[in-house]
């Protein structure tokens, strides 16, 4: 499961960047097409990747026809803030710059692979680390909590910084930071468990910087389908990095004969990547690819950004829905392998586990299924949304809602199937997770549509914070608590060990249904919130005197 834990954050950060920037780019193209007349030109937009006003917006999950919008007095055309000689005017980029941007995206994607490789290398050797430090389960829980909490707290901070300061410097510093911390943590003496806890917290901070900021840079480097491709590559790095992390952890541990060496691989690669980011990633302006970079000067305070986001109903409801996904994935990832092991004990196809880790084989199968459904879910969701957009403007949240509600059914069926068939349970897990993960890219699209460019990093960060806080930060413990509560009132037997955990896990489909409801609520406000965001972008493109955000 873990390989997908933060994918929504990365997808959100990446994909949400795309549509608004697309609109900005088209607007600037329209300005350039006006040929310096000082008004909004009627001619087609000039330059690659730039389309005219009423054209369709290319996003990761397809394209949607945009209703023509513009400031008063220019119906049917985008806002036009500058003449061809004004601050928005740019010359077409030479091909070499295209290659440079490709290299930059590749480096950022590699960084994302390393980000997750590092996280799951630690996950891969966690049992060894626990054994070495004499960590009890409550201590392991503390390690998990400290990581998630520090990630949660740091994300909004980096969101704020990412909307205001040099992103590639913050990014590189973040990579250097977590690399140094991870490398140092491989030398922590056995008696200093608290240092291990501190190091996990610090790594959470470092990784929060990457997850929050990197996608927004990619969003500002590319246009249209190219950006779609680059963003896809960027967040497909998550399951890839996670899988490589487990592989790296176990193989380096075996080769070196000491688990400590596993923690020294990703930091070395991280330092190299951090340096490459500094060298190869251009210091793009926000909205650069849309050729609005110089015009997006309007800066609002963090408090104002937060107020605007909290008032944005589509954003709030989709964030709550994302929390429901996070709740379910966190709980299922933690407990499903053990639940399936207990199911096999009840079916007498496995022995009671007295020496943990229990259900190691089930963990492996579940991990593989989760990683694959991560890929499949994104593709399915994107395809379904592309098709549904031909039918309705509310396609994005509606596809998410259907995916969630369908997922809830199959998650419920896991507990029915597990009693008699483990294979059946795995099939239900496969379908349930595919549907659950199908809303990743779309949720990102929703955020991108309804949030203006200058507060996107903050929006991604706040969504990441919320989804961890209400989702996977507490769900594994809540399920464990409910299971123990049920078990206390029943007789001690393998059957009740299995049933109590199953009953506790039944909370997940209910939360997923709740998430589906939140997506339906998003659908109610989506069109109006998207229109409002477009109007604000148009205002941002005006000369400073007329800007009101």
């Amino acid at each position: 499961m873990m390989c997908l834990e933060c994918a929504s954050a990365a997808a959100g950060g990446a994909e949400e960047e795309e549509a608004d920037a697309e609109r900005r780019r088209r607007r600037r193209g329209a300005q350039r097409g006006a040929g310096g007349s000082g008004c909004c030109g009627a001619r087609g937009a000039g330059g690659a990747g730039v389309s005219a006003a009423g054209d369709e917006v290319q996003t990761l999950s397809g394209s949607v026809r945009r209703a023509p919008t513009g400031p008063p007095g220019t119906p049917g055309t985008p806002g036009c803030a500058a003449t061809a000689k004004g601050p928005g005017a740019q010359q077409p980029k030479p091909a070499s710059l295209g290659r440079g941007r490709g290299a930059a995206a590749a480096i950022l994607s590699l960084g994302n692979v390393l980000n997750y490789l590092d996280r799951y290398t630690v996950a891969g050797v966690l049992l060894d680390a626990q054994q070495h430090f004499g960590v009890k389960d409550r201590g392991a829980g503390l390690l998990q909590s400290v990581f998630i909490c520090s990630f949660m707290v740091a994300a909004p901070i980096f969101g704020y910084l990412g909307d205001r300061f040099n992103r590639k410097v913050i990014l590189s510093c973040g990579i250097f930071f977590w690399s140094a911390v991870t490398f140092s943590s491989s030398f922590i003496p056995q008696q200093y468990f608290w240092l291990l806890v501190l190091s996990r917290g610090l790594v959470g901070i470092g990784e929060a910087s990457y997850s929050t900021i990197a996608p927004t840079i990619i969003g500002d480097l590319f246009t249209k389908n190219t950006r779609t491709l680059m963003l896809s590559v960027f967040y497909f790095a998550i399951p890839l990095g996670s899988g490589l992390g487990y592989i790296t952890g176990s193989s380096v541990k075996q080769a070196a004969g000491d688990w400590h060496w596993a923690l020294r691989v990703s930091p070395v690669l991280g330092m190299i990547t951090g340096t490459l980011i500094l060298i190869l990633v251009p210091a793009t302006k926000r909205g650069h690819a849309d050729q609005l970079g110089d015009q997006l000067k309007a800066r609002t305070s963090w408090l104002r950004d937060m107020k605007a986001l909290i008032r944005n109903r589509s954003y709030v409801f989709s964030s709550l829905a994302t929390s429901a996904v996070s709740f379910a994935t966190g709980a299922l990832g933690m407990w499903i392998p053990l639940y399936l092991h207990r199911a096999q004990v009840v079916q007498k196809t496995a022995e009671t586990c007295n020496s943990p880790p229990c259900g190691a084989k089930d963990s492996l199968i579940f991990g593989a299924i989760t990683c694959f459904t991560g890929f499949l879910g994104v593709v399915t969701g994107a395809g379904a949304t592309r098709w549904c957009r031909l039918k309705t403007q509310r396609a994005d949240p509606l596809v998410c809602a259907v995916g969630m509600l369908g997922s809830a059914i199959f998650i419920c069926l896991i507990f029915v199937a597990a009693k008699s068939s483990i294979v059946g349970a795995y099939i239900c897990i496969f379908v349930g997770e595919t549907l659950l993960f199908s809303n990743w890219a779309i949720t990102a699209d929703i955020l991108m549509y309804v949030v203006i460019p200058t507060r996107r990093a903050t929006a991604v960060a706040l969504q990441s914070f919320t989804s961890h806080l209400l989702g996977d930060a507490g769900s594994p413990y809540l399920i464990g608590f409910i299971s123990d509560l049920i078990r206390q009132s029943t007789k001690d037997s393998p059957l009740w060990e299995f049933l109590s955990l199953g009953y506790a896990l039944m909370l997940c489909p209910f939360v997923v249904v709740l998430g589906g409801m939140f997506f339906l609520a998003t659908a109610l406000f989506f069109v109006s919130d998207r229109a409002r965001a477009e109007q604000q972008v148009n205002q941002l493109a005006m000369p400073p005197a007329s800007v009101k955000v």
Partner: antibody, heavy 125, light 107 residues
């Protein structure tokens, strides 16, 4: 005051079984990891088995020389730790010490901060 | 398994002298070494934990040092009650192992 008192030792024949018991007091037993360490006559110390607390699923670890023959267990309600010894061999003859690992709530030290007085187990035909 | 070697096996000293007992590990074990004292017909007792950390109730004349593979237990001005066997133990990885011991005897 921390106290560890071992009982159950004696003279047994090779191949037979014996169960050692260690009664504890003076500390929160349920949170503490416990081990058995033995010492053959005139020889050095040898760690035998370790049992973790309930918060660590009472996971047990064993020395290779006794794996599959000895079983460590605990009863938190009685604050006792046990060592069930099956298929005893001549080389199992030793003084068996019940030991406590220092506890730090979130983690535990693998060293032994308190030792019992020891109980003699003699395996001979 | 990590093998611990203690030297010398026996050390003869006169009371009031200062001594150093050595413990060498077969591989690097950071500071995961602990020292025990076992007097004749008694149970062992913990003297030093994690190579150099002192234990409450243990006289300050006992001190430890070292990291990696080489460790030292130092006794500053040996007293009569110190004549006993000293064991080092590693906790870097399971199985937990002890050194063969160093016997400190009166010269």
């Amino acid at each position: 005051e921390v106290q560890l008192v071992e009982t159950g030792g004696g003279l047994v024949r090779p191949g037979s079984s014996l169960k050692l018991s260690c009664a504890t007091s003076g500390f929160t037993f349920s949170d503490t990891w416990m081990s058995w360490v033995r010492q053959a006559p005139g020889k050095g110390l040898e760690w035998v088995a370790l049992i973790k607390d309930k918060n660590s699923n009472s996971e047990a670890n064993y020395a290779e020389s006794i794996k599959g023959r000895f079983t460590i267990s605990r009863d938190d309600s009685k604050s006792r730790v046990y060592l069930q010894m099956n298929t005893l061999r001549d080389q199992d003859t030793a003084t068996y010490y019940c030991t406590r690992h220092e506890d730090f709530y979130y983690y535990s030290g693998y060293y032994f901060d308190y030792w019992g007085q020891g109980v003699m187990v003699t395996v001979s035909s | 398994d990590i093998v611990l070697t203690q030297s010398p096996p026996t050390l003869s000293v006169t009371p009031g002298e200062s001594v150093s007992l050595s413990c060498r590990a077969s591989q690097g074990i950071s500071t995961s070494i602990h020292w025990y004292q076992q007097r004749s017909n008694e149970s062992p007792r913990l003297l030093i934990k994690y190579a150099s950390q002192s234990i409450a109730g243990i006289p300050s004349r006992f001190s430890g040092s070292g990291s990696g593979t080489d460790f030292i237990l130092s006794i500053n001005r040996v007293e009569s009650e110190d004549f006993s066997v000293y064991y080092c133990q590693q906790t870097y990885s399971l199985p937990l192992t002890f050194g063969p011991g160093t016997k400190l005897e009166v010269k």
